[in-house]
Interface confidence: medium
């Protein structure tokens, strides 16, 4: 994040940016930036594998939920969207695309349907779903 | 928006930021930045006037919907929140805090209740509500 004050002095801007303001990113063009993470919601319904491929093609991954505090904007997300959580049948655990295990108490997992993939729904819920069902999806890019 | 390439060369960073990536803002700390506008969702329920005062104290205004394209993140917002739209009884029009008139086809106005203020709901809907009813609210700051 570039200090607004530094950028101001650098470019000798007339407009005074308050010290409490800052830039967010960098993110792909027209993505949402929040607490230095980048998010994009894709309207087109794809299965989990196609959704993953779409995110990867944009140098991102499917949504990873790692912090209720840093990702509290997710509380307000309407509807259901693929996230990067998958079931590992060998050990029965749920893990993210990057191989990390789902931390306890982050998501309420609702395992009523058969499936090895998960939909994100508002208020930090994860609905287990068949990976081949088309759904909208959320891509995420964590800034360095 | 500061060109990622320019900032890269300026600070001689090792990490190469793609040309398509950019910074967003500036915004108040921990606000959502999208297409160079800043948004914050406030959980605390206040009436419309208190909500407006809260936004103003943060150098922002209540949400103004001006473009479905530039504000398409609002499609997926869960629940109902005060926005800066008010009814002008003298001429029967709806206008924003800055005095501009609500553009046609931007919001579907649903007059469920008697009132002169409006709640924003997902998919660009505006619900008419009594201004003194407490609700959560969205503040917005347009970057220069």
């Amino acid at each position: 994040i570039w200090s607004a004050v530094f950028l101001n002095s650098l470019f000798n801007q007339e407009v005074q940016i308050p010290l409490t303001e800052s830039y967010c990113g960098p993110c792909p063009k027209n993505w949402i930036c929040y607490k230095n993470n980048c998010y994009q919601f894709f309207n087109e319904s794809k299965n989990w594998y196609e959704s993953q491929a779409s995110c990867m093609s944009q140098n991102a991954s499917l949504l990873k939920v790692y912090s209720k505090e840093d990702q509290d904007l997710l509380k307000l997300v309407k509807s259901y969207h693929w996230m990067g959580l998958v079931h590992i049948p060998t050990n029965g655990s749920w893990q993210w695309e990057d191989g990390s295990i789902l931390s306890p108490n982050l998501l309420t997992i609702i395992e009523m349907q058969k499936g090895d993939c998960a939909l994100y729904a508002s208020s930090f819920k994860g609905y287990i779903e068949n990976c081949s069902i088309p759904n909208t999806y959320i891509c995420m890019q964590r800034t360095v | 928006i500061w060109s990622a390439v320019f900032l890269n060369s300026l600070f001689n960073q090792e990490v190469q930021i793609p040309l398509t990536e950019s910074y967003c803002g500036p915004c108040p700390k921990n606000w959502i930045c999208y297409k160079n506008n800043c948004y914050q969702f406030f959980n605390e329920s206040k009436n419309w006037y208190e909500s407006q005062a809260s936004c103003m104290s943060q150098n922002a205004s209540l949400l103004k919907v001006y473009s479905k394209e530039d504000q398409d993140l609002l499609k997926l917002v869960k629940s109902y929140h005060w926005m800066g739209l008010v009814h002008i009884p003298t001429n029967g029009s709806w206008q924003w805090e800055d005095g501009s008139i609500l553009s046609p086809n931007l919001l579907t106005i649903i007059e469920m209740q008697k009132g002169d203020c409006a709640l924003y709901a997902s998919s660009f809907k505006g619900y008419i509500e009594n201004c003194s009813i407490p609700n959560t609210y969205i503040c917005m700051q347009r970057t220069v």
Partner: antibody, heavy 118, light 110 residues
């Protein structure tokens, strides 16, 4: 197309048992959670129980807990409701309904009437 | 006594608009999706609205749902005689670990 057909209803005395069945067709039954919902004559809908796709998770309404058991046989595409210690207040039309993650009860059967009377 | 509260009946003239309310708590409506079902006389219920305000395919756009906090409402515009039915709101309840319905509202088209 999706079809759910309930059977097994009838007249039964208080304290006795009855088993309802719901035959499913037109979709992959083994992939979906299923519910039972009932409706007493002239009254509203009351949720009874739900079972996950593989039968590992079951939830019941307080009014039937300990008396009713929901189960399924995926090889037969059939959902069951075993009702023991029946009471007059269990008199109702019993519906089975398919659960979908996003739409909840998207398909319903036509119902089977259970009358508990001496 | 239902966990979700609905008015027992509403009535309105043809071509008018009617709204049916549904009141709950943070453990059901406040934190979970609200669905609405229509039950025509002598028929099984039919899904009318899901996830607060979404319409399943085949349902007329005269029906609309909304939710605010722990309350939800169903609006029907351009009322027709075939809309005469019982309408139920419903949601999962995190405290009860079960699905809860409203008591139902009988709509009469005058």
């Amino acid at each position: 197309q999706v079809q759910l057909v309930e059977s097994g209803g009838g007249v039964v005395q208080p304290g006795r048992s009855l088993r309802l069945s719901c035959a499913a067709s037109g979709f992959t039954f083994s992939s979906y959670a299923m519910h039972w919902v009932r409706q007493a004559p002239g009254k509203g809908l009351e949720w009874v129980a739900v079972i996950s796709y593989d039968g590992s998770n079951k939830y019941y309404a307080d009014s039937v807990k300990g008396r009713f058991t929901i189960s399924r046989d995926n090889s037969k595409n059939t959902l069951y409701l075993q009702m023991n210690s029946l009471r007059a207040e269990d008199t109702a039309v019993y519906y089975c309904a398919r659960y979908d993650n996003t739409r909840i009860f998207d398909y319903w059967g036509q119902g089977t009437l259970v009358t508990v009377s001496s | 006594q239902s966990v979700l509260t609905q008015p027992p009946s509403v009535s309105e003239a043809p071509r008018q608009r009617v709204t049916i309310s549904c009141s709950g708590s943070s453990s059901n409506i406040g934190n979970n999706a609200v669905n609405w079902y229509q039950q025509l006389p002598g028929k099984a219920p039919k899904l009318l609205i899901y996830y607060d305000d979404l319409l399943p395919s085949g349902v007329s756009d005269r029906f609309s749902g909304s939710k605010s906090g722990t309350s939800a409402s169903l609006a029907i515009s351009g009322l027709q005689s075939e809309d005469e039915a019982d309408y139920y709101c419903a949601a999962w309840d995190d405290s009860l670990n079960g699905y809860v319905f409203g008591g139902g509202t009988k709509l009469t088209v005058l």
